[in-house]
């Protein structure tokens, strides 16, 4: 795929990161399986507040109120994990603010271990009722498959009551697991019925079953761990984003780039552009201009905003946004109409150029 | 798996040039940098520049800017680092790394010497 | 550009020490910070990225914390095979520069 010619030398690199990039690094917000969780959207002057989850819209439901500007969570369970967004609407504008939600009861690194909780699932039973092994808190084993990055602790739980006490032991695959079995081992707290791995590597993967018996019975969980090689990664950029726009001669539009980075990203806002009536330099490629990017003297660079625009204005405007480990480009295209028509959004074209992913 | 296979040690006089090879294997050439960092003798390390080979975007660190160039060959997955106008400070060994700066190549020793 | 400064230089420790190595940024380079680590005539090695987290098979007991200029780099119980050159790195802007290193040896 081609590269391109840049129309004027413009230095690309900014002198100092950039200020606002929200979105890079999203605020986290964990609970427990299980418990509720109240988050409140950081947008002022918000006439309408709309929200979404992984992008898709949410809506109130037995389990998630909406309020104002609180979103509340009842009963968190992992599926409840993702990439929250809250858009507040104004008269001008709109503005949005995301943040993660990640339920897990999984111990993440630089966690504190000690594992206070969990002290309640040990119950004691009156001894003349003899009972065979029960599961006394099925919400703490609902999440079967867990996907956890590589080098973090991990922590399966199988709380349970029984007359006598029973015991617990795990199975790997199917087979008796030893502390052999992993470099360094691993720890069952067996007042908290609990099996714990410290900094898991990809060999960890697999099924492990917790056994828990006594002479009236045998119970058993399995859970299957997956463990994600854990890497930074190059910019992602909200899909959709930006999006077609149109609108009349003289009028102003705004294109929207949301990125998602690890590290601290470098939006350009780059337009095809023609030198002596022609749209390809000598070497064939084509001619871009750079028309923001973000550095000390940029604002907001997630958004390019077009005042008074002409018929030359339109055309396909990219967003290109880098970090240390890669890129990532997306584009709309601008229709510019006479003023007799009226304007309106384009959602049903998408474009992007050849040598652009 | 990943790996990153550098060309071998070269021994070039005063001015001249030298260009290095690195081959990727094992995951998307054109969807990470490819990074040129070098350590001389006993030394730290210095960051030279990056590619992204996807579109020949190159970046440079400004003590290197106009000697040192990089570039990438998509079809044969392989970044370049060739260094001109050498000079005696500049024998040391230079790695090669992805974008993400988790693989390495083995490193290539350049020695210059009259 | 950005300047880092690591400190300190060098550091004998006994095994099972807590070891703890301290990098300053010029300019806030939010958490855009990687620890390395290389031993003689060897690549570095990919310990820690973005200021926290701990890459792919690396031990639990290296961690990294900090944000803006100030970050740290820590053992939590050193072990004989830590032995090594530890660099800090920004990748906040380019030229992504490094730190001069911490040369670690066993008492």
């Known amino acids: 795929r081609p590269s391109f010619s840049l129309v004027e030398d413009t230095t690309l690199e900014p002198e100092e990161p950039p200020t606002k990039y929200q979105i890079s690094q999203p605020e986290v917000y964990v609970a427990a399986p299980g418990e509720s969780l109240e988050v409140r959207c950081l947008l002022k002057d918000a006439a309408v507040i709309s929200w979404t989850k992984d992008g898709v819209h949410l809506g109130p439901n037995n389990r998630t109120v909406l309020i104002g500007e609180y979103l509340q969570i009842k009963g968190a369970t992992p599926r409840d994990s993702g990439l929250y967004a809250c858009t507040a609407s104004r008269t001008v504008d709109s503005e949005t603010w995301y943040f993660m939600v990640n339920v897990t009861d999984a111990i993440s690194s630089g966690d504190d271990e000690d594992d206070t909780d969990g002290a309640e699932d040990f119950v004691s039973e009156n001894s003349n009722n003899k009972r065979a092994p029960y599961w006394t808190n099925t919400e703490k084993m609902e999440k079967r498959l867990h996907a956890v990055p590589a080098a973090n602790t991990v922590k399966f739980r199988c709380p349970a009551g029984g007359n006598p006490m029973p015991t617990m032991r795990w199975l790997k695959n199917g087979k008796e697991f030893k502390q052999e079995h992993r470099i360094g081992g691993y720890k069952v707290r067996n007042q908290h019925w609990s099996l714990i791995m410290e900094s898991v590597v990809p060999s960890d993967k697999g099924n492990y079953t917790c056994v828990v018996e006594n002479e009236y019975g045998s119970i058993n969980h399995t859970y299957h761990l997956d463990v994600v090689e854990r890497s930074p990664h190059r910019p992602i950029l909200q899909a959709g984003l930006p999006a077609n726009a149109s609108t009349v001669v003289g009028g102003d539009v705004e294109f929207v780039c949301k990125v998602y980075s690890d590290a601290q990203p470098h939006i350009q806002w780059i337009k095809h552009v023609e030198k002596n009536g022609s749209k390809y330099g000598p070497d064939g490629l084509p001619y871009l201009k750079v028309l923001k990017h973000s550095g000390i003297n940029s604002s907001n660079a997630e958004v390019l905003a077009l005042f008074n625009v002409t018929e030359a204005d339109a055309g396909e405007y990219i967003c290109k946004v880098s970090n240390y480990i890669g890129q990532a480009n997306q584009s709309a295209w601008l229709t510019v109409l006479p003023k007799q028509q009226a304007p309106g959004r384009e959602k049903e074209i998408t474009a992007s150029p050849d040598y652009l992913e | 798996q990943v790996q990153l296979v550098q060309s071998g040690a070269e021994v070039k006089k005063p001015g001249s040039s030298v260009k290095v090879s690195c081959k990727a294997s094992g995951y998307i050439f054109t969807s990470y940098n490819v990074h040129w960092v070098r350590q001389a003798p006993g030394q730290g390390l210095e960051w030279i520049g990056s590619?992204?080979?996807?579109?020949?975007?190159?970046s440079y660190n400004q003590n290197y800017k106009g000697r040192a160039t990089i570039t990438a060959d998509k079809s044969t997955s392989t970044a370049y680092m060739e260094l001109s106008s050498l000079r005696s400070e500049d024998t040391a060994v230079y790695y090669c790394a992805r974008g993400d700066f988790a693989y390495w190549g083995q490193g290539t020793l350049v020695t210059v010497s009259s | 550009d950005i300047q880092m400064t690591q400190s300190p230089s060098s550091l004998s420790a006994s095994v099972g020490d807590r070891v703890t190595i301290t990098c300053k940024a010029s300019n806030g380079v939010s958490n855009d910070i990687a620890w390395y680590q290389q031993k003689p005539g060897k690549a570095p090695k990919l310990l820690i990225y973005s200021a926290s987290y701990r890459y792919s098979g690396v031990p639990s007991r290296f961690s990294g914390s900090g944000s803006g200029t100030d970050f740290t780099f820590t053992i939590s119980s050193l072990q004989p095979e830590d032995i090594a050159t530890y660099y800090c790195q920004q990748h906040s802007t380019t030229p992504y520069s490094f730190g001069q290193g911490t040369k670690l040896e066993i008492k």
């Open positions: 590619i992204y080979p996807d579109n020949g975007d190159s």
